[in-house]
């Protein structure tokens, strides 16, 4: 597979099909497929050295492993993009040895001297054709000699199978399944062969592709595959509940940020509430997690403004629950990113000298932001697409909290609707859909660079859409959504996290 | 440009309440990722933090002191407040008040000329 | 127009977060360093940091009659923020 650890090294090799037989339209999907692959492979922060070969009768280098831009996904990606299914047209034929050559001359070294440290580079070849070779000879002799090259399969005590990875995509009209079976990797448990009908779901050829046991604490990863489940598509998503005798029980959301603790709203919980009536589960699993201690942001106080008429004041809803026992990160138990951390930048693909105030302006810019929530709806963890009103829509956004119970009298709105506060919901520029009480506490998420970044906490909203447990689908205009921005809690969350080891800006 | 500036009583007696006041410029304690802290040292001794406050008012304190100060802030009028209650002859020293960009990359940008505070019977 | 090295030892790794200071005999402190070898607006280029764990260093090459100081390193890396004892630097 191919094994995506931030800290190793990888050449990744893809070679596409040009010729006659496979068509334009399967050229251009084939071209997508690989696009998809290279922001996949980025998404995890790893910066494999790509070269890129297109051929037909020739082939044609566009992209050596060996030029300084190789690494950078994104310019790999602008030349893959750049590529016509014409540049062939003139000698069309189908000499897949050849092209297996170019990649060859790209791992090969120069005087036959290996450099210090060949041999911790892994090497994938992606090649994606029909298997019609028609000129040239056979191209699995050319497998063969890279096999020699990278000192694979000849000394039984280290094998170094690992080390060599070849994917062969059938793409085209007609595909000769032998041709292509006797190009790929043959690993026990490993699927290395994929057809035209896979890539109508590459979430799931991905993950039958990728190994990703080295970066399972990366925050913000989720997987999309068909066979995952809700904790695989949000795993940092936590289910919050407090048994409280004779008062029945609350329920929330919360959001896994390290090892040992789940954000969520301070608001969940009372004061009275001890931790052995808390429970928090993660992943999906039945069973409840231990929890040590939490932590309430010293500024919150839910009756810090009764005297003035407010009977519920939510500014700086947040807590920490710390847990008694570690995590196990695994594939529907991760991390989300927080703001202000090395953990998003590295997420979002930004210089490691970018600062908090410049995370904040790519995340939360001053106009409508594209975000998301996640909601249980009979018993399925549900995105729900939001809009965060951060620029001129902000200001109306927040006068209508005049319409939440008990704030009617409310003179200044900006007495309830704290500089903590992000505002959702309403109708422009498209209809959001609302929170429920069973939300609260959970993540506000933008999602960006395939990466889920929480930026806010769902802490309270102007319009119960959701009673008898079943949203309502037509709410007033006025139903807005109010969720603490993480953004201005930063200094709590710091001190808090210290020892988390998430790298605070 | 950023100016702080600390004043204080100067003299005090043994468990009087010290308070301080750091009024500045050039900047908004309103402003994201801006702070304000207090920073001791007595005659002849190195630094000491003593407490800061963030631009969405929240506060910390240094943890190690005998007596937990509090600060607080008027933001309209661009001031920082330091109190320190039952003050003895250990809080001798010069206070300075200091500008902190929020983030562990940054130090304490700008300093005050400091303020001294002598605790005498 | 000498070359002087100023160390400074934390108790844990504190991950570059690390500030240098100095403080004039008549009380005025400026910050120089900050993350470790970041060099503060309007300092010097003479003056320079580096380190990394546990253990850090300020230089100031071709000393300068003004930088005659006590030089302070501070640790933003947990609260509570800390300072060294601070070194006094006066030249022959």
């Known amino acids: 597979k191919i094994v995506l650890d931030p800290s190793g090294s990888m050449n990744i090799y893809l070679v596409l099909d040009g010729s006659d037989s496979i068509g334009a339209s399967n050229f251009t999907g084939a071209k997508k497929c690989l696009v998809n692959l290279i922001e996949k492979v980025a998404s995890y922060g790893v910066k494999p050295r790509y070269g890129l070969v297109t051929y037909a009768t020739y082939p044609k280098i566009w992209v050596k492993v060996s030029e300084a831009d190789s690494s950078n996904a994104d310019w790999v990606t602008k030349q893959l993009n750049e590529i016509n299914y014409e540049d062939h047209k003139l000698k069309s034929g189908t000499n897949t040895k050849k092209a297996l050559q170019a990649v060859y001359s790209m791992m090969s070294w120069p005087d036959d001297v290996p450099p210090e440290g060949w041999n911790r580079t892994r090497h994938v070849i992606i090649l994606m054709t029909d298997g019609l070779h028609n000129m040239g000879g056979d191209p699995i002799t050319v497998i063969d000699e890279i096999r020699d090259l990278l000192y694979i399969g000849k000394d039984r005590k280290n094998p170094r199978e690992d080390y060599l990875d070849v994917y062969v995509f059938g793409v085209g009209p007609l595909v000769n399944q032998v041709n292509i079976n006797a190009l790929a990797s043959k690993k026990d448990n490993e699927q290395h062969v994929f057809k035209v009908k896979d890539m109508e779901n590459l979430e799931d050829v991905f993950y039958q592709m990728i190994d990703e046991s080295q970066s399972l604490s990366l925050c913000g990863m989720v997987w999309e595959h068909r066979k995952g489940t809700d904790y695989h598509k949000q795993p940092w998503q936590a289910k919050i509940s407090v048994i409280r005798p004779s008062k029945g029980h609350e329920s929330c959301m919360g959001a896994v940020v390290s090892e040992y603790f789940v954000l969520t709203a301070a608001h969940c919980f009372t004061v009275d509430d001890k931790e052995h009536s808390i429970k928090v589960s993660v992943g999906g699993e039945k069973r409840d997690l231990e929890i040590e201690v939490v932590l309430f942001h010293p500024n919150y106080n839910i009756n810090g403004k009764k005297e003035a008429g407010i009977p519920e004041f939510y500014d700086y809803d947040v807590a920490l629950i710390k847990l008694k026992n570690k995590l196990k990160y695994g594939q529907t138990i991760r991390p989300i990113c927080l703001p202000c951390t090395e953990g998003t930048t590295r997420a979002l693909r930004l210089p490691p000298t970018t600062t908090c105030q410049q995370q904040k302006e790519e995340l939360l810019p001053a106009q409508d932001i594209k975000a998301l929530f996640v909601s249980e709806e009979e018993k399925k963890l549900t995105r729900k697409e939001v809009y965060i009103k951060n620029g001129d829509k902000k200001g109306s956004c927040e006068r209508d909290a005049q319409y939440a119970p008990g704030y009617d009298k409310v003179k200044d709105i900006s007495e309830v609707v704290t500089p903590r506060f992000l505002c959702t919901g309403g109708v422009s520029p498209y209809a959001d859909p609302n929170t429920c009480r069973g939300d609260s506490g959970g993540p506000l998420i933008v999602h960006k660079r395939s990466r889920f970044i929480q930026v806010g906490v769902i802490s309270w909203g102007v319009v119960d859409v959701c009673k008898n447990q079943k949203r309502q689908k037509q709410v007033p205009a006025h139903a807005r959504d109010f969720h603490i921005n993480l953004f201005q809690v930063l200094p709590w969350l710091k001190e808090k996290l210290q020892d988390e080891d998430l790298g605070f800006l | 440009q950023v100016t702080l500036k600390e004043s204080g009583p100067g003299i005090l007696q043994p468990s009087q309440t010290l308070s301080l006041t750091c009024s500045f410029s050039?900047?908004?304690?309103?402003?994201?990722?801006?702070?304000v802290g207090w920073i001791r040292q007595p005659s002849g001794k190195g630094l000491e933090w003593l407490a800061s406050i963030w631009w969405n008012d929240d506060k910390y304190y240094n943890s190690d002191l005998k007596r937990r100060p509090t600060i607080s802030r008027d933001t309209s009028n661009s001031q920082v407040f330091l109190k320190i209650s039952s003050v003895d002859t250990a809080d001798t020293a010069t206070y300075f008040c200091v500008q902190i960009p929020y983030g562990s990359r940054n130090g304490f940008d700008y300093w005050g000329q400091g303020t001294s505070l002598t605790v005498s019977s | 127009g000498d070359r002087v090295t100023i160390s400074c030892s934390a108790s844990?790794?504190?991950?570059?977060?690390l500030n240098w200071y100095q403080q004039k005999p008549d009380g005025t402190v400026k910050l120089l360093i900050y993350?470790?070898?970041s060099l503060h607006s309007g300092v010097p280029s003479r003056f320079s940091g580096s380190g990394s764990g546990t253990d850090y260093s300020l230089t100031i090459s071709n000393l300068e009659p003004e930088d005659v100081a006590t030089y302070y390193c501070?640790?933003?890396?947990?609260?509570?923020?800390?300072f060294g004892g601070g070194t006094k630097l006066e030249i022959k």
């Open positions: 993350y470790t070898s």
């Open positions: 501070q640790q933003h890396s947990k609260l509570p923020w800390t």
């Open positions: 050039g900047f908004s304690l309103s402003t994201f990722g801006l702070g």
């Open positions: 844990q790794g504190i991950n570059n977060y």
